[in-house]
């Protein structure tokens, strides 16, 4: 496919742009000028000037907005001001305000928790497959499949933590070294960035919204995809990670410490605990090739056990294999030695839900994921709802200047490296990046926060979940203690060297642009969020891993032509963008690939057609329900729901059924209630916040 | 009770094979070791192997490997013991013994023993 | 194989007398030394095992003390039925092997 999702025939002009996939758009074309477009790449188009770092990229049949997309919408207040309040409107209003509050922190510790049950539940359906990925003895040698297993493991458990642990307790039992332990962090550093992607796929029901907190949430995926792509060829040539941090390690003479501060565990682990418990030793242990954890459950049972170690009489194969040699005896035909166990007697039973079911862990995960999805999703809409409602006018102002604002001349710069440190700490409290980027994704949709700011955010973020885990590695026991510092100081140098690359400049600022170019394409086609998740996180990395199973030549045989076809595609860009003149007719522009591989509109037009069978119910059923069936059927009017399936029809007829973006509407309010999601009475009785 | 009934005394020329029996009752056959123990004529004690009649696993004294086969038949619950290649010195009583103290190497209960004699 | 060296080879002790046999090692051998006594004419009869249990039936005066290479083996009060050949087996390595026996007579 051609790196933008949507290729005409244009002609650059360095004056003059049009927003292709990403970046601005102050004009637009007038739509009745195109009408003789085709899928015919020799019929004449018009001609569209274009920003040469846009190349030759259009979106076909763009649907026209006024304004940039990217511009914050106008939190604008519609309801009576403080001052024109009676004292009844003012204690009334004041205890609304107070009530929403309450309701926002309640729906945002729910959001916390179902964070943290959406983790159990994936380590449940695929903690023990993540735990195999470990055992494969080919980590050592290959770093790519290193990568691909870091990626792999932290999707399937929902946890870079866990994922990390894990390698830190096998390079403390010497199955793995740090040298292949480094691409699986760096892969877990990539996996760790779903989990608010999969949040922003929430947002789906307004195009506009979910166009920002995509672009939010992928920007993350965008730092770090890109941030190994540079840095893991850098690593395996130079193993610069492995030599600071082994130089660290060794020149301080380090204590064990006290464990990381569990605040927001503290806070929601009484919940959670009562939902699932898991017993998360038994990924680790099916890592290490311990044959009896394979058939281990996950979901702890006995919460209060009894440990009594006691000697024991067992067959050893040979006498070399004996505890000592005083501890060694024979039967006449067995060797026979005294091995200490520790004898486990179970007291109580943990107090969760599943305790006494007995139900398989991937039922329990599949309950749980389901669940914890629903509840996921229906915070969400309930945290934007609030947000919505209070973020107006005067508050709406003070908070966007606040945070959106840079530092008067000439310290402008400094206030990126401040977001950057606001996110380490955020993320310091929460004990999780997930966690704080999750948090932060709904702000962006909603427009609280521009991408530009949550992009230093978001590199904050993953600088202070190494912070926790340096912290957890000063309290680890003296044999892990090395292992597990120097980890989780590779995690922390590998993610400063990313912001090196990523951020002090400007111009290298380029998860910003992707993730913004994904975010229109997202917005137009809601099915391609879903469908980059799937390749990104899962395909991509399955295909590596199997690759590098078959061994090095299929790996290089496979690989290498699919690099050389994607040099060649962002060469010939970069061509078509900043010198055409010296290609051929022909290669200055996409259009002498057939449109499938130029556009997404062919490929739309498929996945409209396996949808279709959806459409007609898809808007039939609950809000929430409602907003997951948005996302596959793409339907324009979808949060409408009453309204859904008569739209969807007239859809169908071949009328487009355009959605007015919420920013040219005075407020969120309206724009929601336009698009038939709050009752038009909501409007009149809003709050106005002090 | 547990009883180890061993096979006759034998007179066998040097080179010659000598395969005696060691009948078992009073326990099952299958649980414990049988150890085979030879004593030379005024000399001490000197084992010669182990077979275990669950599984048929044997273990033998380096002195004896190649020279003595030791089978067990469970349906009989009887052990057997060839011994091959017999020199004069082979000479003694061979006993039959169990150790019912489960992983150790301490036999307690011994059959009668069988002289065999080899003579020219 | 493991050497068991039994002494003295024999000994001659008055009804009464506390006698005591030792027997050594030529290497590490834990506690899996066992003595069995052989009464003349008769077959071997465990007395010991693990080096200081006795087995079921054996009279509280045979007592056996000892680890590593160094073991003995005590009848506190001989009794005129305790005359016999007793020896030490161990059997901390394949082969089991004996010690040469200890011959102990009544005054």
């Known amino acids: 496919m051609a790196p933008w999702p949507e290729l005409g025939d244009a002609q650059p002009n360095p004056d003059k742009y049009l927003e292709g996939a990403a970046g601005q758009q102050p004009t637009a074309p007038d739509k009745s000028k195109e009408t003789n477009k085709t899928d015919n790449t020799e019929a004449p188009v018009t001609k569209i000037e274009l920003l040469p770092s846009y190349s030759t990229a259009t979106l076909i049949d763009e649907p026209t907005e006024v304004d940039d997309p990217w511009n914050l919408p106008t939190l604008q207040d519609s309801g009576i001001k403080w001052s024109e309040r009676d004292t009844k409107g003012k204690i009334l209003c004041f205890f609304q305000g107070i009530g929403r509050l309450i309701l926002l922190l309640g729906f945002l510790y729910f959001f916390v928790c179902s964070l943290d049950i959406l983790s159990s539940a994936f380590q449940l359906v695929g903690g023990k497959m993540a735990g195999q990925f470990f055992s494969n003895s080919s980590i050592m040698s290959n770093p790519l499949l290193g990568l691909v297993i870091g990626v792999l493991v932290t999707v399937l458990v929902q946890s870079s933590s866990t994922s990390t642990s894990i390698v830190v307790s096998m390079v403390s039992s010497s199955l793995l070294t740090v040298r292949a332990a480094i691409p699986i962090i760096m892969g877990a550093n990539i996996g760790t960035s779903i989990t608010n992607t999969i949040v922003a796929l929430m947002q789906v029901g307004d195009r506009s919204e979910f166009r920002r907190a995509f672009a939010g949430a992928t920007v993350h995926d965008f730092f770090n995809w890109l941030s190994v792509l540079v840095l893991l060829p850098v690593e395996v040539a130079t193993h610069y990670l492995e030599i600071i941090t082994q130089l660290i390690v060794e020149s301080f003479h380090f204590k064990n410490g006290e464990d990381a501060p569990d605040l927001l565990k503290v806070i929601t682990k009484p919940f959670t605990k009562l939902i699932v418990q898991l017993d998360k030793k038994v990924i680790s242990q099916i890592a290490m090739n311990d044959e009896k954890a394979k058939n281990k459950s996950l979901v702890k049972i006995w919460c209060k056990t009894f440990t009594n170690k006691t000697q024991i009489n067992v067959t050893v194969p040979s006498t070399a294999n004996c505890t000592s040699p005083s501890l060694c005896w024979t039967d006449g035909i067995q060797n026979w030695t005294m091995k200490n166990v520790t004898y486990k007697e179970n007291i109580a039973k943990c107090q969760h839900i599943f305790v006494n079911f007995h139900l398989p862990d991937l039922a329990v995960g599949t309950i749980l994921l389901i669940l914890s999805l629903l509840v996921l999703c229906g915070c969400l809409i309930m945290i934007v709802k609030i947000l919505g409602s209070v973020l107006k006018g005067q508050v709406a102002t003070v908070i966007k200047k606040t945070i959106n604002t840079d530092f008067p001349f000439p310290f402008a710069w400094l206030t990126g490296y401040l977001a950057i440190l606001v996110g380490a700490g955020m993320t310091f409290i929460v004990q999780s990046s997930s966690v704080f980027t999750s948090a932060l994704t709904p702000l962006i949709g909603i427009g609280v926060i521009t991408i530009e700011r949550a992009y230093p955010l978001t590199l904050g973020s993953n600088i202070g979940t190494t912070t926790t885990a340096i912290l957890a590695a000063l309290a680890s026991p003296g044999n892990a203690l090395r292992s597990s510092l120097q980890i989780a100081l590779c995690h922390f140098f590998f993610n400063i060297s990313g912001i090196l690359l990523w951020y002090p400049i400007p111009f290298t600022r380029l998860p910003i642009r992707m993730a913004k170019g994904l975010g229109n394409i997202s917005a137009k086609y809601r099915w391609f969020a879903v469908f980059y998740l799937i390749i990104f996180f899962f395909l991509i990395p399955l295909t590596v891993f199997g690759l590098s199973l078959a061994g090095w030549r299929v790996l290089v045989g496979v690989g290498v032509p699919v690099v050389f076809i994607i040099i060649l595609v962002l060469c010939l860009r970069l061509l078509q963008s900043r010198c055409p003149r010296v290609l051929p007719k022909k290669l200055q522009n996409w259009n002498f690939l057939p449109l499938w591989m130029r556009s997404l509109k062919p490929w739309d037009a498929v996945v409209s057609k396996f949808t279709g069978c959806f459409q007609m119910r898809c808007c039939c059923c609950c809000r929430v329900c409602c907003r997951a069936c948005c996302l596959l059927c793409d339907c324009p009017k979808c949060c409408r729901c009453s309204k859904c399936c008569e739209d969807l029809e007239e859809a169908q007829e071949g009328q487009d059924v355009p959605v007015k973006a919420p920013e040219t509407f005075d407020n969120i309010t309206i724009s929601r209630e336009a698009q038939g999601e709050v009752p038009a009475s909501d409007s009149k009785t809003e709050c106005t916040a002090l | 009770q547990v009883q180890l009934v061993q096979s006759g005394a034998e007179v066998v020329k040097p080179g010659a094979s000598v395969k005696m029996s060691c009948k078992t009752s009073?326990?099952?056959?299958?649980?414990?070791?049988m150890h085979w123990v030879r004593q030379a004529p005024g000399q001490g004690l000197e084992w010669i192997g182990a077979?275990?009649?669950?599984?048929?696993?044997?273990s033998y004294n380096q002195k004896f490997k190649g020279r003595v086969t030791l089978t067990a038949d469970k349906s009989t619950s009887t052990a057997y013991m060839e011994l091959s290649s017999l020199r004069s010195e082979d000479t003694a009583v061979y006993y039959c013994?169990?150790?019912?103290?489960?992983?150790?190497?301490?036999?307690?209960?011994w059959g009668q023993g069988t002289l065999v004699t080899v003579s020219s | 194989d493991i050497q068991m060296t039994q002494s003295p080879s024999s000994l001659s002790a008055s009804v009464g007398d506390r006698v005591t046999i030792t027997c050594k090692a030529s290497?590490?051998?834990?506690?899996?030394v066992a003595w069995y006594q052989q009464k003349p004419g008769k077959v071997p009869k465990l007395l010991i095992y693990w080096t200081s249990t006795r087995h079921t039936g054996v009279p509280s005066r045979f007592s056996g003390s000892g680890s590593g290479t160094d073991f003995t083996l005590t009848i506190s009060s001989l009794q005129p039925e305790d005359v016999a050949t007793y020896y030490c087996q161990q059997y901390s390595r394949i082969p089991l092997t004996f010690g040469g026996g200890t011959k102990v007579e009544i005054k």
């Open positions: 013994s169990i150790s019912t103290i489960i992983t150790t190497g301490a036999v307690d209960y």
């Open positions: 290497q590490d051998v834990g506690t899996a």
């Open positions: 009073g326990y099952t056959f299958i649980t414990y070791n």
């Open positions: 077979i275990y009649p669950g599984s048929g696993d044997t």
